[in-house]
């Protein structure tokens, strides 16, 4: 990946748009297709002040852990979908796009240096465990994906890219 491509806001916006499209395709979280088992996903809620006050290294740890869990979750959803009878083609397409998107974002974040922080997280003993929740529908899964990109990932890359510019 070209260095710091993630710092071009249009790149992240493309993935956010894909995630929103996937959420819309699943027809709303109440009546949309259900997952045959609950899947653990990262909690995407952000207390904006608390997030901004975190060290960028701590943000990186949380983003990296969230990205890993989200990737696992979507791969798990793909496996569940493959085992279901007559999986809708459009849903399969969006699962594949999400997996591809998460792989690309992971590569882009590596270039930004987020992975380094995970190898030696600051005050690892004091770091709070990643908050999680469960998704029981494809809609909720894609909504978490969309919110994670719009929230923690976008805020982290904004800060990390700004630092890199100094």
């Amino acid at each position: 990946a070209p260095p710091r491509l993630i710092c071009d806001s249009r790149v992240l916006e493309r993935y956010i748009l894909e995630a929103k499209e996937a959420e819309n395709v699943t027809m709303g979280c109440a009546e949309g297709p259900r997952l045959s088992e609950n899947i653990t996903v990262p909690d995407t809620k952000v207390n904006f002040y608390a997030w901004k006050r975190m060290k960028v290294e701590e943000q990186a740890v949380e983003v990296w852990q969230g990205l890993s869990l989200l990737s696992e979750a979507i791969l798990q959803a793909q496996a569940l979908q493959a085992n279901s009878s007559q999986p809708p083609e459009s849903l399969q397409l969006h699962i594949d796009k999400a997996i591809s998107g998460l792989r690309s974002l992971t590569s882009l974040l590596r270039v930004l240096g987020a992975q380094k922080e995970l190898m030696s997280p600051p005050d690892a003993t004091q770091a709070a465990p990643l908050r999680t929740l469960t998704a029981d529908t494809f809609c909720k899964l894609f909504r978490v994906y969309s919110n994670f990109l719009r929230g923690k990932l976008k805020l982290y890359t904004g800060e990390a890219c700004r630092r890199g510019d100094r």
Epitope: K45, V46, N47, F48, Y49, A50, R53, N147, R150, K154
Partner: antibody, heavy 117, light 108 residues
Framework: EVQLVQSGAEVKKPGESLKISCKGS????????IGWVRQMPGKGLEWMGW????????RYSPSFQGQVTISADKSISTAYLQWSSLKASDTAMYYC??????????WGQGTLVTVSS | SYVLTQPPSVSVAPGKTARITCSGD??????AYWYQQKPGQAPVLVIY???KRPSGIPERFSGSNSGNTATLTISRVEAGDEADYYC??????????FGGGTKLTVLG
């Protein structure tokens, strides 16, 4: 004890400029943000913007962008809200509040601004 | 821009439970905050991060948030709880949005 003390009530004419202040004490001023909130007579709370006095980062509500200017002087632990040209519709109570992980956890007493010809 | 909608008024008898709602598109994806404002006074934060209480706020105040609706629940309502209540939330972009407010009337 955390305290935010705001400047006194103001009566102004349309077109005049104004700068009101909010002085923080009892805590590290640069470790928290200051937010500004408008409350028009008999109406609800409206977030105007916040400032991080440490990094001088400011975010305005889209409704107030270009209408007011938020600033801070960390050397005297004071935040400011200013207008270059007041309108009658700016008549309101203006509150400053400390922003922490518990947002707007401490409030000033409010500054009443009256704009009338 | 993001909009939070509250009922203009809620009435409750003393000793009963009051529930004040706040609705917004996918509000459950964001943290909800609640403020109490008595006439002539500055607002006071009573709930933050959906359900946490700042120190000094009685246990009678609780909050929840899921789907499109956040709810402030005040159990064993007292006359002193009569006030305007405002919900709020952070957006991902860093804007802080207040709801229109709900006037809580304690009957009797």
């Amino acid at each position: 004890e955390v305290q935010l003390v705001q400047s006194g009530a103001e009566v102004k004419k349309p077109g005049e400029s104004l700068k009101i202040s909010c002085k923080g004490s009892g805590y590290s001023f640069t470790s928290y943000w200051i937010g500004w909130v408008r409350q028009m007579p008999g109406k609800g709370l409206e977030w105007m913007g916040w400032i991080d006095p440490y990094r001088s980062e400011i975010r305005y509500s889209p409704s107030f962008q270009g209408q007011v200017t938020i600033s801070a002087d960390k050397s005297i632990s004071t935040a400011y809200l200013q207008w270059s040209s007041l309108k009658a519709s700016d008549t309101a109570m203006y509150y400053c509040a400390r922003v922490s992980s518990e947002p707007f956890d401490s409030w000033g007493q409010g500054t009443l601004v009256t704009v009338s010809s | 821009s993001y909009v939070l909608t509250q009922p203009p008024s809620v009435s409750v008898a003393p000793g009963k439970t009051a529930r004040i709602t706040c609705s917004g598109d996918k509000l459950g994806d964001h943290y909800a905050y609640w403020y109490q404002q008595k006439p002539g006074q500055a607002p006071v934060l009573v709930i933050y991060d959906d359900s946490k209480r700042p120190s000094g706020i009685p246990e009678r105040f609780s909050g929840s948030n899921s789907g499109n609706t956040a709810t402030l629940t005040i159990s064993r309502v007292e006359a002193g709880d009569e006030a305007d209540y405002y919900c709020a939330t952070w957006t991902f972009e860093g804007d802080y949005v207040f709801g229109g407010g709900t006037k809580l009337t304690v009957l009797g």
